[in-house]
């Protein structure tokens, strides 16, 4: 699961698609906050 503030799957989607990577659709759990806070 993705517990980060702006979920890696969202943020790196463009980069991965341009480099041929595959992105799994995921989400940030609503009860877990951001490690960047």
């Amino acid at each position: 699961s993705c517990n980060t503030a702006t979920c890696v799957t969202h943020r790196l989607a463009g980069l991965l698609s341009r480099s041929g990577g595959v992105v799994k659709d995921n989400f940030v759990p609503t009860n877990v906050g951001s490690e960047a806070f």
Partner: antibody, heavy 122, light 107 residues
Framework: EVQLVESGGGLVQPGGSLRLSCAAS????????ISWVRQAPGKGLEWVAE??????????HYAEAVKGRFTISRDNAKNSLYLQMNSLRAEDTAVYYC?????????????WGQGTLVTVSS | EIVLTQSPATLSLSPGERATLSCKAS??????VSWYQQKPGQAPRLLIY???NRYLGIPARFSGSGSGTDFTLTISSLEPEDFAVYYC?????????FGQGTKLEIK
């Protein structure tokens, strides 16, 4: 250059309302989660509210002390964050900071504004 | 709500000495702990995130450790500019919370 500039603070009577703004520049505002954090005079830090990024549905969370009275919102087109504060109490007196943060897995970004003072007094 | 308890409340040390600040959480917060430095009249400044990761531009003399409920901020050799108030925070659960702060003062 990254900047977060809060405005809208001032003196308000108990029971009154204020709307704080936070203008962002120098980074991709829509990607960031943003919180308001406050600090009463001579006291510690207290988290107030958070709004998540556009891709995280702009979900909101609030501290119990402000739930039902404060509303956090954002306008990504204007790179702006807002805090609508209603039914203000003396204990809401504080410097209010906006804080933007971004976690991209390998590292993070964390930016604070300079704060705006809200004084609730009759 | 997760309560963070910092100790000591005040720490009096001299430049060049080692500072050890503690933060204890009332419930497990894995590694979702940050440390902030605040000087009078200024906004807080992030030092450490994820319990042990130094933020961009933070000198190597600052280090963080811990997981679960017990966390430590260590400043290996104090510089004059390090005397300030330090706060820990947790973002593992809502509401996000801060410790009450440790004031690091010059002895």
């Amino acid at each position: 250059e990254v900047q977060l500039v809060e405005s809208g603070g001032g003196l308000v009577q108990p029971g009154g309302s204020l709307r704080l703004s936070c203008a962002a520049s120098g980074f991709t505002f829509s990607n960031y989660w943003i919180s308001w954090v406050r600090q009463a005079p001579g006291k510690g830090l207290e988290w107030v509210a958070e709004i998540r990024s556009e891709s995280d549905a702009s979900a909101t969370h609030y501290a119990e002390a402000v739930k039902g009275r404060f509303t956090i919102s954002r306008d990504n087109a204007k790179n702006s964050l807002y805090l609508q504060m209603n039914s203000l109490r003396a204990e809401d007196t504080a410097v209010y900071y906006c804080l933007a943060y971004f976690d991209y897995g390998l590292a993070i970004q964390n930016y604070w504004g300079q704060g705006t003072l809200v004084t609730v007094s009759s | 709500e997760i309560v963070l308890t910092q100790s000591p409340a005040t720490l009096s040390l001299s430049p060049g000495e080692r500072a050890t600040l503690s933060c204890k959480a009332s419930k497990r917060v894995t590694t979702y702990v940050s440390w902030y430095q605040q000087k009078p009249g200024q906004a807080p400044r992030l030092l450490i995130y994820g319990a042990s990761n130094r933020y961009l531009g933070i000198p190597a003399r600052f280090s963080g450790s811990g997981s679960g409920t017990d966390f430590t901020l260590t400043i290996s050799s104090l510089e004059p500019e390090d005397f300030a108030v330090y706060y820990c925070s947790q973002s593992y659960n809502y509401p996000y919370t801060f410790g009450q702060g440790t004031k690091l003062e010059i002895k």
